[in-house]
Structures are given as C-alpha cells and as structure tokens.
C-alpha cells in the first residue's frame, strides 16, 4: 500500500536505520556530498520501513565473504510513497540504502517522471559507514513548492553493473485553482447568444466555476470544470469573469469586456487633398468602428449650386486608405461632399458636409460650324466660328488658338495664331499660293487649350482666279473636305 | 423528461407544522438549487428563497426566516419546505422550482396547497 | 431589493388583438424572464432571458427591452392565451416577480 503524508505530519527522524547506536548521538556522517547547496526546511521525509527492503530493481552480488555466505540482495528501503503539501511550502525526502563495503565508488542520481534531475537541485548524499555495510542516504528538497515540481521522484544506483531503483515518491502540489482558459473579450451582435469557457485545475480537484456577469453570479450552484456559458444575449456591454473553486479556496479571472456591434460613428475631418478641374482629391478620419470592422465607404457629392436640381453622386470605395479622388466633376463648379462607412451592422451617418471647388479646365469641346473662305482681293484667309457651350468651356474662355498649316508641293508649314474672346472670326495672311490651307480652332481658357476642331481645308489658287466659296467644317461622315477655289 | 412532482394538500390547524416535499428526475439533482415559491390566494407570487442542493446550504428571502425550512434528502434526489407555527396566512399554494442559470425557474412543480384554518 | 412593476394590471382585448405587457424595474436589470398562469395550473416559463422564447412556446409571443423597462408582446391573441403573466428579474438576489397581468377577453 501505498504510505501517504500530509504537511500537518511530524517530521520523521533523519535515519531509522538497522545499524546499532543512535545517528544523533555515535553516527556522525563521514562524508557528506552536496548537490547543491541550499536551506534545508524543517519538514523532512524519511524512510519508515527500514526492515523491509522492496522487491522491485534488487541487485544480487557475486561476491561472497570469508565465510562463503552470499550477500543479501541490495534494494532500496520503503519510504513514504505519496506527500500532499501546499504550493510555496518546503520538503524534504529521502531514499536510503545500505550498500556492503566492498562496494566502492556508488553515487545516488534522481529522476523525476524519468528524467534525470541535474544542476542546482537541492539534492544531498550522506554516507554512514559501519564494519560491513555503509548506509547511504540520498534526501531532496524543495525549499517552495510550485505546481511544476509535481511528479514522480525515484533514486538510481549503479552498482556491479545493474541499476538499483528505488520506489516513486509522489508530490503532489496543491494550491488554488489555475487558469488554463479564461474567457476572452468579445465583440458581438446584439441580442444574439454566444459561448464563453472557463476551465480551471487542481490540485485539488475538483474545481468548481461560478460565472459572474456584471458582479451578478450567473449560476447559484457550481459547475464542474470546463463550464462553458451560453449569454442568451446582451443589450448593452457587459463584464464577465469566472471563479473557479477548489479544496483551497477561490481564484477569479481576468474580467473581460463583451461590446455590442452597432453602426460606426460618421467619419470626421473630411479634407481636401488635391483639386483639378474634374476631379478631388479627399481624405477623411474614420469615426469610431462600432467594435465591427469597417467593410466600405460611401462619398456622396451634390452640386453646391442653388440652381442644380439637387441630384446626389455616389461613390462607393474601401474603406482604406481613407482617401477617395472623386472623378467625373465639371470644371470651376462647386461641391457638397459628405462621407459614410459601413461595417456588419450597417451604414454611420453622414460625416459633416464640406464645400470644394473644382478649378478651371481646358475647354472639353472645340468651337463649332468653322467655315474658311478665301478673301482674294486682300489676299486674306477669313475664318469664323462658333464658341462652345457654356457648359463644356471648363472656364472663362480667355481667346482662342488657330492653327493653319500650309501645304505645297511637298512643302508643309504650321503657323499659330491667338486671338481674344470676345470675337468669333478671324483673318489670316495667305501664306503660300497654289497651296492647301488647312485650319484648326481651339477654346482657351486659364486652365489650358481645349481640342482642336476637325480640320477644314482650303485650296488657294494662283493668281488669277476669280470663282472663290467657303470651306467649312465637314458635316458628319465626311472625312477630309477640300474645297478648291 | 424534467420532472418535479410535489406532495398533496394539507389542512392544518394554526401552530402545527406542514412538510411539503418536492421530488425532482430527469436531471442530475446535484446540479441545480430548487427554488419555493408562494401563491396566496388570489395574489401573485412571491419567491420564499431556495436551497444550493451541491452544498445543502439554503438562503431565504426576507419575510421567509424562522419559521420555513428548506431541507433535501439527495439519495432520493427530494427537497422539503417545512413551515412550523403555521398561521392562517400562511394559506397558500406553494411551488417548487428549478433554478437555472440567471435565477430562470425552468421547470415546476404542480403545486401543493397548504390551508391554515382552525 | 428591485421591485418589479406590470402594467396594466388588467388588460382587456379580443382575440386575434396584440398585446403589449410591461415591466418596469426600480432599478437595472440584467435580464427578465416571464411566466404565464392559468387559473389552477402552475406558472409556466415563457420568455427567457428578456428575449428567448422557452421550449415549445409560439412565435407570436415575444419578449424585448434593457435596463429598467421590459415588454412582452402577444402578436395577434388566441383563445388559449388569457392568462396572468408575470414578470422575474435577474441581477440580485432576492430574485423578485413583477405583480402580474391578467389578459381577458373584451
């Protein structure tokens, strides 16, 4: 059976053993061999069964006496075989042994759970000799107990080429119970049940858990460890933590916060980056994600104008980097831009509107119905035109921008001419006689030179011609028009 | 299936004493506090306390200590309210419950009318 | 202790009418439970924990609310559903009942 001592237990005496005299008294060690230096507490296990030595790992020597007796076979004494004490306490335990003289160079190691304890270990040998035999003892100790040195402890002897094994001794460390899953925090969709686990260990076992929930026990009787608690499902934040209970009294978790999923807060700081004439540049700060992860944003932009029919322009992006260029906008126009992010649950509210402008552009179409003729008695090229929409002028048109290219017998000449805003015709020098003259008109505003009209050419004669009509711009279809005068 | 089966009515004089008995199966017994509660006669209920049947222990609400005892016999998986000095308003029918987690009283007992009359 | 308090103590209604019963808490609570009573027969649970439905019982009952103020709700009345219903909080002990609701027939 297994021997079992409990901290309150009396230390036992250093060593009971079957050698005469007392060890206090006549029985000074000889040697003493320290593994380790260290406090030796007062609470020491020892051998209680000296007599009987154990059955288990016996060497039996070969050599015999004088008188031919062969000698006992060697085993380590019984001892105690189970010790219970409280984590942070010190012990002391011990195997014993009497090993006959002729013997020579035997050490003790220590296992536990069939590893060799090696380094620092407060492991101490003692030896006692006598006229035949030599008593040894190998004693261990533990100055606090932690949970970790739980486990089971055996002596090794090497003698005569076998190994002598002595039986285990089994610490058993107890304290208050010790997490190995706590709850953790959690975001969560309201009024939706989810799952939360706390398992706590001995020794002692068991260990019972309680739930707490907003400093409110869930369970009024205990639950064996793991628990696992379903929430039925929450309204508002709440702080769940868990006890676990054992022998030795109570140990509570880690309290964690469980948030509810809502829609995020509107973004804030909505910026202007970057303008051009079609297109802004904006950034804004994300407001606060609701405990859900931002999916998408939303930028809504409408025309600052009072006369605009109040339509609203969206455009949807990801809602990183938190930075959008909106594109597609009307030159030299003012905007109400406004942003929204969304998570799981739904769309925030619109981030405070911001006023932005874009600047002037180029003109995006070229003026209209160019018609050339040739003004031969002042030997002139007269070319009109129409101005381009309003709204496609991207700007206040500050002129325009001709260009006339002069083609003869191989011989190609581009000339460029600017001309105010306010007219819609224009007179050029001929150039060149018995030449092409093909003509192109462009708007011009601050913010650049729109596109140049569809070429529209013109034949100048010799000298001497008389007939003579105007060119103009092709109708539709009709790819490069000459007109020969 | 979940089961609470209580004991009959009682008549009893004033100053006698009543044992209501509550037998609980289909659950391990152990693991959850049966509750007691209180229906005077046309009024509603009222919760009397219940008793942890892991640890025996038993907590009474206000109104409810002295004279009402809980007690369980776990080997037959029972719990008892005893009301001793009776009185005649302590006429009423009195229930048996299971307490789940968050104090629901999941499941009941059919009831057992207690009349305190001379 | 929290006192729980139903209104409106009686409410009259015809069948297939919605009902709508209320319990207010003296203080926060974490969740309400409700039982329904009738005449003889013990409480039966009904809505667990302010919003679940206990087993076996229809989907036109419902049960909503947070903090202090909580409500049941009968979608469309049938005959079998005149009863007295009470409110039961959960957050501290002593565990208190509301003072009931009695739903008859109009």
């Known amino acids: 059976a297994i021997t079992e001592a409990r901290e309150e237990a009396k230390p036992y005496p250093l060593f009971p053993g079957p050698f005469p005299g007392s060890l206090q008294t006549d029985h000074t060690p000889l040697l003493s061999l320290p593994h380790a230096s260290g406090y030796q507490p007062a609470l020491m296990f020892s051998p209680t069964q000296p007599g009987r030595p154990h059955t288990g790992n016996v060497a039996i020597p070969q050599v015999t006496s004088v008188e031919s007796k062969p000698l006992p076979p060697l085993a380590f004494k019984h001892t105690v075989g189970h010790i219970i004490l409280s984590e942070h306490k010190g012990v002391k335990f011990n195997c014993s042994i009497s090993v006959p003289n002729i013997y020579q160079d035997t050490t003790i190691s220590w296992w536990k759970d069939g590893k060799e304890l090696l380094g620092a270990h407060h492991a101490i040998t003692q030896f006692y000799p006598d006229d035949e035999v030599t008593a040894i003892i190998a004693s261990f100790s533990i100055t606090s107990v932690q949970r970790s040195d739980n486990g089971s402890y055996i002596c090794k002897m090497k003698i005569n080429n076998e190994e002598i094994v002595s039986d285990p001794i089994y610490i058993e460390v107890q304290g208050l119970p010790h997490f190995t899953k706590q709850p953790e925090s959690m975001n969560v969709t309201r009024n939706t049940a989810f799952n939360l686990t706390c398992q706590a260990v001995g020794p002692p076992e068991p260990v019972n858990i309680f739930w707490v929930q907003n400093s409110s026990r869930v369970n009024e009787q205990p639950e064996k460890s793991p628990s696992v608690l379903t929430v039925p499902g929450l309204t508002e934040m709440a702080v769940f933590s868990c006890e676990a209970h054992n022998d030795k009294g109570l140990t509570v978790s880690k309290g964690v916060q469980i948030n509810i999923k809502a829609i995020p807060s509107p973004p804030t700081e909505v910026s202007i980056r970057n303008s051009t004439a079609h297109s802004i540049l904006i950034s804004w700060v994300p407001g606060f994600d609701g405990y859900s992860p931002f999916r998408n944003c939303s930028i809504q932009v409408k025309e600052a104008d009072p006369l605009s029919n109040g339509s609203v322009m969206i455009f949807n992006t990801s809602a990183l980097p938190h930075l959008y260029q909106i594109k597609q906008l009307q030159a030299l126009a003012n905007y109400s831009i406004g942003v929204s992010c969304m998570n799981e649950i739904g769309w925030s509210a619109v981030s405070p509107w911001i006023l932005a402008s874009t600047t002037e552009g180029a003109p995006s179409v070229a003026p209209l119905n160019v018609t050339v003729f040739l003004n031969e008695s002042s030997d002139n090229v007269d070319i009109r035109w129409m101005k381009p929409p309003t709204k496609q002028q991207d700007g206040e048109l500050v002129g325009y921008r001709i260009s006339h290219v002069w083609q003869s017998a191989g011989i190609s000449k581009e000339l460029l001419e600017e001309v105010g805003q306010n007219g819609s015709r224009a007179r050029i020098s001929v150039q060149v006689h018995n030449a092409t003259c093909t003509v192109r008109i462009a708007a011009v505003t601050r913010g650049g030179v729109g596109p140049f009209s569809d070429p529209v050419k013109i034949f100048i004669p010799a000298h001497g011609w008389v007939d003579y009509a105007p060119s103009s711009t092709p109708a539709p279809g009709n790819a490069d028009p000459v007109l020969i005068i | 299936q979940v089961q609470l089966v209580q004991s009959g009515s009682e008549l009893k004089k004033p100053g006698a004493s009543v044992k209501v008995s509550c037998k609980a199966s289909?659950?391990?017994?152990?693991?959850?506090?049966v509750h007691w509660v209180r229906q005077a006669p046309g009024q509603g209920l009222e919760w009397m306390g219940w008793?942890?049947?892991?640890?025996?222990?038993?907590t009474y609400a206000q109104g409810f200590t002295g004279r009402f005892v809980f007690s369980l016999d776990t080997s037959v998986s029972t719990a008892y309210l005893q009301i001793s000095s009776l009185k005649a308003e302590d006429t009423a029918v009195y229930y048996c419950?299971?307490?789940?987690?968050?104090?629901?009283?999941?499941?009941w007992g059919q009831g057992t009318l207690v009349t305190v009359s001379s | 202790e929290i006192v729980l308090t139903q209104s409106p103590a009686t409410l009259s209604l015809s069948p297939g009418e919605r009902a709508t019963l209320s319990c207010r808490a003296s203080s926060s609570v974490g969740y309400m439970h409700w039982y329904q009573q009738k005449p003889g027969q013990a409480p039966r649970p009904l809505i667990y924990?302010?919003?679940n439905l206990a087993s076996g019982i229809p989907a036109r009952f419902s049960g909503s609310g947070s903090g202090t103020s909580y409500t049941l709700t009968i979608s469309s009345l049938e005959p079998e559903d005149f009863a007295v219903y009470y409110c039961q909080q959960w957050s501290s002990n002593p565990r208190t009942f509301g003072g009931g609701t009695k739903v008859e027939i109009k």
């Open positions: 419950t299971r307490g789940a987690r968050y104090a629901y009283m999941d499941y």
């Open positions: 008793i942890n049947t892991y640890q025996g222990e038993p």
């Open positions: 924990a302010t919003s």
């Open positions: 289909g659950y391990t017994f152990a693991n959850y506090g």
